[in-house]
């Protein structure tokens, strides 16, 4: 069964910078990746970035840079411009559309006790929804 993993990490040098890492574990080729925050895409979440292997990427503030790390994983750098850090309590979700499997989505957040530079364990928290 395909799985999606999500890691959220705070940068050690800049406490206002976060990076979301997402990956797809399974067969098939990735046709689209959507990163949202505040909940799953289409279920109360707001798209932060969309990555397509051919069409390119689109991102919206506070996303700073979205890029492919491998053919089945991506990273999204976030810049927190506020004085406090809302990202610390925010859920980030990644949805991978894969042919012919369908869509798979998981969510993650920065662990409350995590130190700067440490990331969340790569434990998938699957949302059981395959389109």
């Amino acid at each position: 069964t395909p799985e999606v993993w999500v890691q959220v990490q705070m940068e050690a040098t800049e406490l206002s910078s976060f990076t979301v890492h997402c990956g797809f574990l399974g067969p098939g080729s990735i046709s689209l990746v959507t990163v949202s925050w505040g909940g799953p895409d289409g279920a109360g979440g707001t798209k932060l970035a969309v990555l397509h292997p051919e069409l390119g990427t689109r991102q919206w503030a506070p996303a700073r840079q979205a890029r492919w790390e491998t053919q089945s994983s991506i990273s999204l750098a976030l810049e927190d411009s506020g004085a406090s850090s809302p990202f610390a309590n925010t859920t980030f979700c990644c949805k991978f559309a894969s042919f012919p499997e369908g869509s798979w989505e998981s969510c993650g957040s920065l662990p409350p006790s995590s130190d700067p530079g440490l990331s969340a364990p790569p434990t998938p928290v699957p949302i059981l929804r395959a389109d």
């Epitope: 689209l32 798209k47 397509h52 069409l55 390119g56 559309a97």
Partner: nanobody, 127 residues
Framework: HVQLVESGGGSVQAGGSLRLSCVAS??????????MAWFRQAPGKEREAVAG???????TYADSVKGRFTASRDNAGFSLFLQMNDLKPEDTAMYYC???????????????????WGQGTQVTVSS
């Protein structure tokens, strides 16, 4: 709940121009559809696709409007525009905005899978 609101319709002489706008709004979050599209329906006729634009900026147009109509989206991703030039009487119709998400981010053919629709804005072109 997602709502689409169109504006910019009106009456114009043949050869004139109009710019339609559509804004997608949602309760509690920002909705950025993969695909936003314009459709139109003239009295007594079936609804037809006019133009579509995906989240990456890729556009498709009906043959009848190519070279005259231009679809665009704002940088924030939730507004859709339609610049209509060299309008003809046969462009008279109610124009509807539609939006939805597709598996690959592109606009599906003929608007299939666009599950949100606006109430429409009337465009009347007189000769």
């Amino acid at each position: 709940h997602v709502q689409l609101v169109e504006s910019g319709g009106g009456s114009v002489q043949a050869g004139g121009s109009l710019r339609l706008s559509c804004v997608a709004s949602a309760s509690g979050f920002t909705y950025r559809p993969y695909c936003m599209a314009w459709f139109r329906q003239a009295p007594g006729k079936e609804r037809e696709a006019v133009a579509g634009i995906d989240i990456f900026g890729g556009t498709t147009y009906a043959d009848s409007v190519k070279g005259r109509f231009t679809a665009s989206r704002d940088n924030a991703g939730f507004s859709l525009f339609l610049q209509m030039n060299d309008l003809k009487p046969e462009d008279t119709a109610m124009y509807y905005c539609a939006a939805g998400d597709s598996p690959d981010g592109r606009c599906p053919p003929l608007g299939q899978g666009l599950n949100y629709w606006g109430q429409g804005t009337q465009v009347t072109v007189s000769s």
